[in-house]
Structures are given as structure tokens and as C-alpha cells.
Amino acid sequence: RSLQDTEEKSRSFSASQADPLSDPDQMNEDKRHSQGTFTSDYSKYLDSRRAQDFVQWLMNTKRNRNNIAKRHDEFERHAEGTFTSDVSSYLEGQAAKEFIAWLVKGRGRRDFPEEVAIVEELGRRHADGSFSDEMNTILDNLAARDFINWLIQTKITDRK
């Protein structure tokens, strides 16, 4: 089965608010989004989804790779079953490590202002609370708390 057959609740990354940390003007932007008023709005929406979708895809890809003998080029997808929230396992994969490395190198400042939103969305997912615990493990394992704080500061000062 392919990736899209899984029930991974990708809607967490299709949030109505493209930029949760923005100023009150964003509320008007969201209203226009819901009405589909402006041509450029969809482009903005896609901009907001881009980084979030990539993280979601990486998470699914790592889970998928557990079901195949070796990793294919471009992280070939072969998904099995439903979303297991196995984020700790996912982070052991080279894909995630490379992704974090990209961000730490400074690409986040201009190209990834959405990462704060990603972390927030991840933290909100799965009401049983297990996902939040895994998020703490993620942050500890990657020594990323300072990185997240940096992202938050970047978000405030370098908003798109």
C-alpha cells in the first residue's frame, strides 16, 4: 500500500491558520482564506504548508522504511498499517537527522519560519497524550530545546 492509504491524520498540517504566531492582521487573512477571495492567498497557504508537509512526509517515510529491506533513493514509500506515532524510531533515521542538520546550519532563519508552528502542531496531535511524551523525547535526544527557542525568536523578528 502507498503512503496515502495510511490514517496519519495529516490534517494537523493543514491547519486553518497558516501562521499561528502572527499578529491580529492574520485573522483577516484567515477570513479571506476561508472565503477564497484573493488569488494570491492559495500561494500563501501553500507556502505555509511546505515545511510542515515535509516533516509529516519524513515521519511517514521513516515508519515505511521499517517495512522494507533497505532504503531506496528519495526515501521510497511502502507504507503499512495506520499511523503509529513512532516518532522516536523515526528520529533514528538518517532522513530526520539530515533534516535537522539543514535547519541547524541556518536555513531556518529565512526559509523555515514555520517550524515553530510544526512543533506546536506535533505537540497538539493525538489526544491520548503519548505523542506529547514522545515530543519531549525528541527534543531531548536532539538537544533541540535551544534550537526551538531560537526558532521562536526568529519567528518574532524575521517573519515573512
Epitope: L3, Q4, K9, R49, R50, N60, D111
Partner: antibody, heavy 119, light 112 residues
């Protein structure tokens, strides 16, 4: 498996209205954005409209903005396209398409329903 | 909108031979932050809807035979069928999903 079945197409006069439906099954409909894409022999494939998983975000191609309205009923796993003030150039096969995890990437398509606008 | 232009419009290739379809975008679809090209390829057989073959320019969708491969970056992309099979006769479309989605005009692949 994922299935998308469109209905509601037909022959209609210019200026009239038509409502297309797309019945979805085989996946958690309420978790995914959905699109309408149309195809004509002359213009090929053309994206028409998008609605987010919860219905809060709706976007339209310039060619249909103000005339078409996309909506969804997650309780019934159904996607809709209300088409008003139809024009001859709206004649096409209309597909509903499921968005993958990646925005604006279409991983499943319905078989399509033909809309013919003619006097 | 980003304009997608495919070449050639039609292509005739002998069974077992290599088929190559090109796609050019009017602006880059490469997202530098993850080094991914937001470019997909679809196959459409007569009377059927399009089927996703490749996304991110070179990643095969699950279940797609490995004779299909995608390459390219930025604005220039290629879909290659390494050894044409009879069932590969179809229309092929490229699509960018970096911005408001747009498609190429299509390439008709036939058997010579």
C-alpha cells in the same frame, strides 16, 4: 482501497447551474484536503478549486472565482462543487482528487463526470 | 501562475526502447530548505483519470514499475521509461505543486 466517485454532470444551458458531488471511501475523508480538477481537449488539465480538511480554507482558479463554490460534508464523506453562471468554456470532465500529505499533489482521482454547457 | 511546457507533444518509441519526455517550468520549483523539487508526473490512459507516477521530481509512487524514473531540478525535468512496454501507451503530464497547481499540456506516447 481509496475510491472517489463523481456524479451530477450533464448537459446544461449557458447561465444555468449544476451541482457536482464526489463520494469518498477507503480513507479518512475528514483528514485530507480535496480538489476539483477539470480536463478539456483544448486546455488539458486545469486545477479548479481546493478545500482544506475542515472546510475552513477554500481557493479557486481565477477562471471560476465568483461562480463556483466548493464545499464538503465530512459526516457523509462527500465533496461538492456548486457551479453557477455556467459558460461554454466550462465544458469539461470534472475530477475530484484527493490531496496527498503534500499540498497540491493529487494521489487519487475519481473517474470524472462530464459537464457540457451548450445551448 | 507557473507555466509548465512539455516536449515533445507526441512520441513514438519501439517496444523495449527508451522513452524520454521533457518538462520545463517558467520558474524554479526547487525549495532550497529541503532541496526538493515540487514536480510530479502523471500517466493517463484512455478513459481513465490521471495516475500519480512520480513526485518530488524523482520519487516513484508506491507500485510504480522501476522502469519509470524522473530527474531534473529547478526548471528542467525529465521522465524516462527505460524499456517501453505496451501498457505504457498513454498521455503523460507533468505538474508543479510548488505554487497554485498547474499542468503541462501533455505528451502522447505511442508504440512505433
Amino acid at each position: 482501497q481509496v475510491q472517489l466517485v463523481e456524479s451530477g454532470g450533464g448537459v446544461v444551458q449557458p447561465g444555468r447551474s449544476l451541482r457536482l458531488s464526489c463520494a469518498a471511501s477507503g480513507f479518512t475523508f475528514s483528514s485530507y484536503g480535496m480538489h476539483w480538477v477539470r480536463q478539456t481537449p483544448g486546455k488539458g488539465l486545469e486545477w479548479v478549486a481546493f478545500i482544506s480538511y475542515d472546510g475552513n480554507n477554500k481557493y479557486y482558479a481565477d477562471s471560476v472565482k465568483g461562480r463556483f463554490t466548493i464545499s464538503r460534508d465530512n459526516s457523509k464523506n462527500t465533496l461538492f462543487l456548486q457551479m453557477n453562471s455556467l459558460r461554454a468554456e466550462d465544458t469539461a470532465v470534472y475530477y475530484c482528487a484527493k490531496e496527498s500529505i503534500l499540498a497540491a499533489l493529487f494521489d487519487y482521482w475519481g473517474q470524472g463526470t462530464l459537464v457540457t454547457v451548450s445551448s | 501562475d507557473i507555466v509548465m511546457t512539455q516536449s515533445p507533444d507526441s512520441l513514438a518509441v519501439s517496444l523495449g526502447e527508451r522513452a524520454t519526455i521533457n518538462c520545463k517550468s517558467s520558474q524554479s520549483v526547487l525549495y532550497s530548505s529541503n532541496n526538493k523539487n515540487y514536480l510530479a508526473w502523471y500517466q493517463q490512459k484512455p478513459g481513465q483519470p490521471p495516475k500519480l507516477l512520480i513526485y518530488w521530481a524523482s520519487t516513484r509512487e508506491s507500485g510504480v514499475p522501476d522502469r519509470f524514473s524522473g530527474s531534473g531540478s529547478g526548471t528542467d525535468f525529465t521522465l524516462t521509461i527505460s524499456s517501453l512496454q505496451a501498457e505504457d501507451v498513454a498521455l503523460y503530464y507533468c505538474q508543479q505543486y510548488y505554487n497554485t497547481p498547474t499542468f503541462g499540456q501533455g505528451t502522447k506516447l505511442e508504440i512505433k
